[in-house]
């Protein structure tokens, strides 16, 4: 099959790092400077990505693979392949159109990115608040209020055993 395919399409023999050059009777030519082809059989080489401005180079371009970018300090990547850089905020803040804003009361953000999220509602799980939440940290839920009442035991005693053939008095 490979041989049949190569006879039909000479470009299929061109390896990564080359392109099938129509100007040279479809012979394989190495990619020109600052371009790449990451797979075989390509008819063109792609221009290398340039990591400029707020982007910085994480991996240099080669003739067989594109450059990879990340973001300069104070920014973080968004999108596939770090297509965008977004400004970091402090913990306890979120990024809005007007810049970094503190989380509203009842919400928190423990990262430098993302949005403020509501504190956990401990009562929904029948628990009480053990440690209060802050702008940077979620609340810590503890045992349920009933478990903390005086005289309450966390161990339920076993039910008394019944003797067979006796009805309860």
């Amino acid at each position: 099959f490979e041989r049949t395919r190569s006879l039909q399409d000479p470009c299929s023999n061109c390896p990564a790092g080359t392109f099938c050059d129509n100007n040279r009777n479809q012979i394989c030519s190495p990619c020109p400077p600052n371009s790449f082809s990451s797979a075989g059989g390509q008819r063109t080489c792609d221009i290398c990505r340039q990591c400029k401005g707020v982007f910085r180079t994480r991996k240099e371009c080669s003739s067989t693979s594109n450059a990879e970018c990340d973001c300069t300090p104070g920014f973080h990547c968004l999108g596939a392949g770090c297509s965008m850089c977004e400004q970091d905020c402090k913990q306890g803040q979120e990024l809005t159109k007007k810049g970094c804003k503190d989380c509203c009361f009842g919400t928190f953000n423990d990262q430098k990115r993302g949005i403020c999220r509501p504190w956990t509602n401990c009562s929904l799980d029948g628990k009480s608040v053990l440690v209060n939440g802050t702008k940077e940290r979620d609340v810590v839920c503890g045992p349920s209020p009933a478990d903390l009442s005086p005289g309450a035991s966390s161990v339920t005693p076993p039910a008394p055993a019944r003797e067979p053939g006796h009805s309860p008095q």
């Epitope: 990619c31 020109p32 400077p33 240099e60 371009c61 080669s62």
Partner: nanobody, 111 residues
């Protein structure tokens, strides 16, 4: 423009070795994509080995493990060391840089 002249071809038995040279004159040598091609009678010219623009050596499947491309920037010379030669390596071998081609050097593998 760049001028290229190959040498080192000849007649060799199967399993033998040859070292081809390509003398480069003209433009800056060290930064160029430099390649070795070959063309067997009645066949299309094929890429054998090359230095990419990132200065990494690459080889066609037919050359891997047997051929080695190298360069001497001070001598402005590109080399192709060919070991374990086979009958199917018989071809005219060409040096290439961009649009510039050498006249070629004949390599014949025959018993």
């Amino acid at each position: 423009a760049v001028q290229l002249v190959e040498s080192g071809g000849g007649l060799v038995q199967p399993g033998g070795s040859l070292r081809l040279s390509c003398a480069v004159s003209g433009n800056i040598f060290s930064i160029r994509v430099m390649s070795w091609y070959r063309q067997a009678p009645g066949k299309q010219r094929e890429l054998v080995a090359w230095f990419a623009w990132d200065n990494i050596a690459h080889y066609a499947d037919s050359a891997k493990g047997r051929f080695t491309i190298s360069r001497d920037n001070t001598k402005k010379t590109l080399y192709l060391q060919m070991n374990s030669l086979k009958l199917e390596d018989t071809a005219v071998y060409y040096c290439n840089s961009g649009d510039s081609w050498g006249p070629g050097t004949q390599v014949t593998v025959s018993s």
